[in-house]
């Protein structure tokens, strides 16, 4: 009875050895495996078993040449040949690699399937075991982040379109009670690209919407600001002295009304004062204090509280000037000193005036949001690397390159 159990164990091990070696030399892996391709060139395709047993997944199964030879001699695939001295193996020259034409690539694509829903701690062996009864699988690619963490999704290449279709159409597939999302690889990328595109469109529309809302708020605030300033404008005009300046106006109204802004340039014959309170009151107080005769540098002046459309236009201009002044101040990153046009408005706080823009990488949430490697629609100047990590190589070669096609 125990012997029977041992036989079963041995048969299972041999099947795994065959499967692993046939994967290494198979249609899918071999064209992508730099190291193995180099080895094949050296001796008419023969690769010493000494080298083969350094491949991690085979190494984990056995390092015994006899076991490997025995296993391969029983293989029904008849892909591999064993040298007479039983120390080397090669892919049978009667089974050459298919020519990698567009037609062949298309065929592979059409039998490639995306499966999502595996726990991120699932191993390749777990997945292989799950796929065991699901059709003939040529390659399993565990999709990983740049930091090599498994994402919980895989690409599987079946041996035929029929077996891929059969798998995809099997309802209610689960991995340990977890529902899976199963799509042909092509359709997965279509879904992902659609998601990306939609989210981009949404983000743009949203930004536009927020911009419009912001603009409306600003306009509302401006209107409110205008309303608050109604009746606060005082126009002055006359044959003014060329040396008349803003300071004269501040002195004249110093105790009668707080001046927010003066629209006046030296040498002009008229200007406008914006008071915090009603202009009429400030003018009245100033007149009273000056016996009814309010002059600038001993020159007669006509004083007029603005109203109606004239007032609105003047207010708009003042608000624009204030904004312009504020922007200038911001860009210079320091306080103005009362120079330039109309600038006795209180300046904003003491910020350094620096604006930092931080680069922002957009991530699309749904599905594989952290899809650093991505075929189709790769962004940026460099086409992103294939998601082909966990390459099987002799240990000595492993840190040097990750050139394989999958995780088998």
């Amino acid at each position: 009875m125990a012997e029977n159990g041992d036989n079963e164990k041995m048969a299972a091990l041999e099947a795994k050895i065959c499967h692993q070696i046939e994967y290494y030399f198979g249609d899918f892996n071999l064209p992508r495996d730099k190291f193995l391709k180099e080895q094949i060139k050296l001796d008419e395709g023969w690769v010493p078993l000494e080298i083969m047993i350094k491949f991690n997944r085979l190494n984990r199964l056995t390092t015994d040449f006899n076991v490997i030879v025995e296993a391969l001699s029983k293989s029904k695939a008849e892909l591999m040949e064993i040298s007479e001295d039983k120390t080397k193996i090669r892919r049978s020259p009667s089974k050459p690699l298919p020519e990698v034409t567009d037609e062949y690539k298309n065929d592979v694509k059409n039998r490639s399937v995306y499966i999502k829903g595996f726990p991120t701690d699932a191993t390749l062996d777990d997945i292989k075991e799950w796929l065991e009864d699901k059709g003939q699988v040529l390659n399993i690619q565990m999709r990983r982040t740049l930091h090599k963490a498994f994402k919980g999704s895989i690409f599987v290449v079946f041996d035929s379109i029929e077996s891929a279709k059969k798998f995809v159409e099997t309802p209610g597939q689960k991995y340990k009670e977890t529902d899976l999302l199963i799509l042909f690889k092509d359709d997965y990328f279509a879904k992902k690209n659609e998601e990306r595109k939609q989210n981009k469109v949404e983000a743009k529309l949203r930004a536009k919407q927020e911009q419009e809302a912001k603009q409306k708020l600003e306009e509302d605030a401006e209107m409110k600001s205008l309303e608050e300033k109604i009746g606060c404008l005082l126009k002055f005009s006359g044959d003014l002295d060329d040396q008349t300046c803003r300071e004269d106006l501040h002195i004249l109204f110093s105790n009668h009304g707080e001046i927010k802004w003066i629209d006046f340039v030296r040498g002009a014959k008229e200007g406008i004062i914006l008071f915090k309170e009603k202009a009429k009151e400030a003018l009245g107080k100033a007149k009273d204090a000056n016996n009814g005769n309010l002059q600038l540098r001993n020159k007669e002046v006509t004083w007029e509280v603005l109203e109606g459309e004239v007032e609105k236009e003047a207010l708009k201009k003042i608000i624009e000037d204030q904004q312009e002044s504020l922007n200038k101040w911001k860009s210079k990153g320091r306080r103005f000193k009362g120079k330039g046009k109309g600038n006795k408005a209180a300046q904003p706080g003491s910020g350094k005036g620096k604006v930092q823009f931080q680069g922002k990488k957009t991530k699309f949430a749904s599905d594989d949001e952290h899809d650093e490697h991505d075929e189709n629609g790769a962004t940026g100047p460099v086409k992103r690397a294939r998601e082909e990590t966990d390459k099987e190589e002799p240990a000595s070669k492993q840190q040097k390159t990750e050139n394989g096609a999958g995780d088998q």
């Epitope: 042909f184 092509d186 359709d187």
Partner: antibody, heavy 116, light 106 residues
């Protein structure tokens, strides 16, 4: 601007079949999925299936296999859904919708009434 | 398939009131999407990827949640918010919708 334009209302006899259409416009992707969603009067939404314009592959909700058949005409960017062996249970509004993993765009819906 | 259960099925709120509706999944999902549907019209994507507002959706709406529990909140109810809201997941085929929450104005 993505738009999904669906065909007009259908009145059919029990046992008959109807074929609804959904024309997509305003999109640059060559391969994308069009889903079909059923809504009975005063009821919720049920996903019937999805067909991909580029690959021609279709995916079905098990519940609607044998009832709905999805096809697509690549050249006219039109998706079709044929409903067969109609019963009163099939009386509903059928929407086509587009999206990644959510449905950002919807057709206006086609009302199917099954009545003897 | 994943079953989504929405509660309450029907609710009413006064203008200005805060409204919260929930969506519970029979197993864990990564993201939840929400749709608004008014009588006689197509559903509109309202919130996607759990918390992102679709364009045109007022900022008073928000979405949150993780795992099996998700919610949609309106900070201050307005008359135009009266509609039926559906949650939806697509973590696996078939994608499924919740039964809907009908929100009425008091």
């Amino acid at each position: 601007q993505v738009q999904l334009q669906q065909s007009g209302a259908e009145l059919a006899r029990p046992g008959a079949s109807v074929k609804l259409s959904c024309k997509a416009s305003g999109y640059s992707l060559t391969n994308y999925g069009i889903s079909w969603v059923k809504q009975r009067t005063g009821q919720g939404l049920e996903w019937i299936g999805e067909i991909y314009r580029g690959s021609g592959n279709s995916y079905y909700n098990e519940k609607f296999k044998g009832k709905a058949s999805l096809t697509a005409d690549k050249s006219s960017s039109t998706a079709y859904m044929q409903l067969s062996s109609l019963t009163s249970e099939d009386s509903a509004v059928y929407f086509c919708a587009r999206g990644g993993l959510s449905f950002a765009y919807w057709g206006q819906g086609t009302l199917v009434t099954v009545s003897a | 398939q994943i079953v989504l259960t929405q509660s309450p099925a029907i609710m009413s709120a006064s203008p200005g009131e805060k409204v919260t509706m929930t969506c519970s999944a029979s197993s864990s999902v990564t993201y939840m999407h929400w749709y608004q549907q008014k009588s006689g019209t197509s559903p509109k994507r309202w919130i996607y990827d759990t918390s992102k507002l679709a364009s045109g959706v007022p900022a008073r709406f928000s979405g949150s949640g993780s795992g099996t529990s998700y919610s949609l909140t309106i900070s201050t109810m307005e008359a135009e918010d009266a509609a039926t809201y559906y949650c939806q997941q697509w973590i696996s085929n078939p994608p499924t919708f919740g039964g809907g929450t009908k929100l009425e104005i008091k």
